[in-house]
């Protein structure tokens, strides 16, 4: 699982790439995306 902290501090990533990784994680974990 990828934590929000890890994602937000992953430098050099586009905002869409962060959304992409969040969404892929959401599809697996069913966390709320809002």
């Amino acid at each position: 699982a990828v934590s929000e902290h890890q994602l937000l501090h992953d430098k050099g990533k586009s905002i869409q790439d962060l959304r992409r990784r969040f969404f892929l994680h959401h599809l697996i974990a069913e966390i709320h995306t809002a």
Epitope: S14, I15, R20, F23, L24, L27, I28, E30
Partner: antibody
Framework: QVQLVESGGGVVQPGRSLRLSCAAS????????MSWVRQAPGKGLEWVAT????????YYPDSVKGRFTISRDNSKNTLYLQMNSLRAEDTAVYYC???????????WGQGTLVTVSS | QLVLTQSSSASFSLGASAKLTCTLS???????IEWYQQQPLKPPKYVMD???????STGDGIPDRFSGSSSGADRYLSISNIQPEDEAMYIC?????????????FGGGTKVTVL
């Protein structure tokens, strides 16, 4: 190894319904989001629907929203696509696909052909 | 509007290097995309995801002859020492989540012929 086998395709008249199935094996089905992607004869790919691992969240493009419903039965390791009010433009090979932690459509089935014609 | 543009076809000599281009709509130039290979009469196969900085992760069973790179809104798929089995349609795709809705679009694909 990951295996996805689609079934349920065939010839159907415009306005009628059809339900596709995708039998999954070789992985823990309940742990991954699943999708349907279609390809009209001689045309490109079009994303049709996505469902989360437990089935709580579903996503559709405007072209099928309100007509198609994606669902899953994790006890049967099976993904479904209920297609209502079918149109000629829905004629396509329908593929099911499995996500990974890295990408949306990492593994694909062989596809099932749906022909909408009177 | 999220759009991917690909040239329709390209031909390469056996053993040559090939470079295919997928261009994002200008306002989406930072986006991560995916590349897929579809051999004739077969389902698509995931090749790689390709980020803005050119970093990429390849799918299962993809030879290391396949690599990716990026420049601005362009995303490149390179094939070194191209082989007969590489003759296929190569399709790029991109997804995004907007207001809790998911969208995913594919490019039209580039048909690669190996001479």
């Amino acid at each position: 190894q990951v295996q996805l086998v689609e079934s349920g395709g065939g010839v159907v008249q415009p306005g009628r319904s059809l339900r596709l199935s995708c039998a999954a094996s070789g992985f823990t089905f309940s742990s991954y989001g699943m999708s349907w992607v279609r390809q009209a004869p001689g045309k490109g790919l079009e994303w049709v629907a996505t469902i989360s691992s437990g089935g709580s969240y579903t996503y559709y493009p405007d072209s099928v929203k309100g007509r198609f419903t994606i669902s899953r039965d994790n006890s049967k390791n099976t993904l479904y696509l209920q297609m209502n009010s079918l149109r000629a433009e829905d004629t396509a090979v329908y593929y099911c696909a499995r996500q990974t932690t890295m990408t949306y459509f990492a593994y694909w089935g062989q596809g099932t052909l749906v022909t909408v014609s009177s | 509007q999220l759009v991917l543009t690909q040239s329709s076809s390209a031909s390469f000599s056996l053993g040559a290097s090939a470079k295919l281009t997928c261009t994002l709509s200008s306002q989406h130039s930072t986006y991560t995309i995916e590349w897929y290979q579809q051999q004739p009469l077969k389902p698509p196969k995931y090749v790689m995801d390709l980020k803005q900085d050119g970093s990429h992760s390849t799918g299962d069973g993809i030879p290391d002859r396949f690599s990716g790179s990026s420049s601005g809104a362009d995303r490149y798929l390179s094939i070194s020492n191209i082989q007969p089995e590489d003759e296929a349609m190569y399709i790029c795709g991109v997804g995004d989540t907007i207001k809790e809705q998911f969208v995913y679009v594919f490019g039209g694909g580039t048909k690669v012929t190996v001479l």
